[in-house]
């Protein structure tokens, strides 16, 4: 289509760290520039429908304009690239959502118990709020055997009950991985024989 869309913004789906800097680039298509009698100088950037001051723009070339944000403090920013033709008609070119948050902290205080006759359950401290979808995975292994990962549910992100039957009288190694769009961290590993973690009914 000639005008649909008129260009694009790069990156397309950015996730950025809170209080960091971020630059987006809007690139216009040739057909669109021709139709609207415009070039990158006619680009107007907006966040949440408010026009960004021109001082934050950089004209890269005749087809591309960039905008830079410093110290991003909002969790969600609707960013649109628009063109103003004839000084009066504003046409949307493209839009993205900038999602902001924090990388996960290293999980702490990992501990596990085995309720008698049941499977092992571990819990931990997940650290600060990241404002992003953060996945916690409990990993465990015995000697050279890796047990199935235990992925924490969204509603209980700081605990997980393993799927496998507990083995006793051998040491297993357990740790937690926390991952989101901004990074991945691993807790300290703990070693124990599950027999010493049994909690009588």
């Amino acid at each position: 289509e000639l005008l649909d869309p008129c260009g694009y913004i790069s990156p397309e789906s950015p996730v950025v760290q809170l209080h960091s800097n971020f630059t987006a680039v809007c690139v216009l298509k040739e057909k669109c520039m021709d139709y609207f009698h415009v070039n990158a100088n006619y680009i107007v950037w907006k966040t949440n429908h408010f026009t960004i001051p021109k001082e934050q723009y950089t004209i890269i070339n005749r087809t591309a304009s960039s905008v830079t944000f410093t110290d991003i403090a909002s969790l969600n920013i609707q960013l649109t690239c628009n063109i103003l033709t004839f000084g009066q008609l504003e046409q949307n070119v493209y839009g993205i959502t900038i999602i902001s948050g924090l990388p996960p902290e290293k999980p702490k205080n990992l501990s596990c118990i085995v309720n008698e006759g049941k499977k092992m359950r571990c819990e931990w401290d997940g650290g600060r709020e990241t404002h992003l979808e953060t996945n916690f995975t409990l990993k465990s292994e015995w000697a050279t055997h890796k047990f199935a990962d235990c992925k924490a549910k969204r509603d209980t992100p700081t605990s997980c009950t393993v799927d496998y039957s507990t083995v006793y009288f051998v040491n297993i190694e357990v740790w937690v991985e926390a991952e989101n769009a901004l990074g991945k961290v691993t807790s300290d590993h703990i070693n124990f024989d599950p027999v010493y973690k049994v909690k009588p009914n």
Epitope: Y35, F36, H37, L89
Partner: antibody, heavy 118, light 107 residues
Framework: QVQLVQSGAEVKKPGSSVKVSCKVS????????WSWVRQAPGQGLEWIGR???????NYNPSLKDRVTMTVDTSTSTHYMELSSLRSEDTAVYYC????????????WGQGTLVTVSS | DIQMTQSPSSLSASVGDRVTITCRAS???????LAWYQQKPGKAPKLLIY???SRATGVPSRFSGSGSGTDFTLTISSLQPEDFATYYC????????FGGGTKVEIK
């Protein structure tokens, strides 16, 4: 071949409203802006306004308080409604495609005569 | 808004004549933003020229446009029977405005 087919002639009373339609065939409605232009009997041409499929509009300042343009993408039809009609609104109303560039009218409808008379 | 004034408002000419129609803008218009249309009685206008001198698809080479700033010209190098019509200039640098028209009649 692009074709713009407009609704039929209308006779209206002063103070009332008129809504004229323009159905686009043989080309994509989403590829261009669409304008309305009117011509009073024996007179020149006057641009009314333009619309894009997103609903983005741009009106002639002299008519903006009385004109509303809409688009129905499911039927590839756009509409121009003019309210508070007066006798000087009597004219042939044309829809037109803006191409090959914005502001240029390369395809036109056949015209719709709107007569405002008491 | 930009006013467009055409002259003459009408003219009589014969087949084969060279015809020149002028259009003056009330303020400077970018040469990218000027178009000419032909309209016959009871019909919709037809695009002839845009961007001052670019011919629209299918328009014969006898039609040409020129000019800059506030003064623009449409020339028909050799008038043909089918060219008897009314001609309008139009600027589209702001919201579009048209000239009052020039009627080309048979002498």
């Amino acid at each position: 071949q692009v074709q713009l087919v407009q609704s039929g002639a209308e006779v209206k009373k002063p103070g009332s409203s008129v809504k004229v339609s323009c159905k686009v065939s043989g080309g994509s409605i989403s590829s261009y802006y669409w304008s309305w232009v009117r011509q009073a009997p024996g007179q020149g041409l006057e641009w009314i306004g333009r619309i894009y499929i997103t609903g983005n509009t741009n009106y002639n300042p002299s008519l903006k308080d009385r004109v509303t343009m809409t688009v129905d993408t499911s039927t590839s039809t756009h509409y121009m409604e003019l309210s508070s009609l007066r006798s000087e609104d009597t004219a042939v109303y044309y829809c037109a495609r803006e191409g090959p560039k914005l502001g240029i009218f390369d395809y036109w409808g056949q015209g719709t005569l709107v007569t405002v008379s008491s | 808004d930009i006013q467009m004034t055409q002259s003459p408002s009408s003219l009589s000419a014969s087949v084969g004549d060279r015809v020149t129609i002028t259009c003056r803008a009330s303020q400077s218009v970018s040469s990218s933003y000027l178009a000419w249309y032909q309209q016959k009685p009871g019909k919709a206008p037809k695009l002839l020229i845009y961007g001052t001198e670019s011919r629209a698809t299918g328009v014969p080479s006898r039609f040409s446009g020129s000019g800059s700033g506030t003064d623009f010209t449409l020339t028909i190098s050799s008038l043909q029977p089918e060219d008897f019509a009314t001609y309008y200039c139009q600027q589209y640098g702001g919201y579009p405005t048209f000239g009052g028209g020039t009627k080309v009649e048979i002498k």
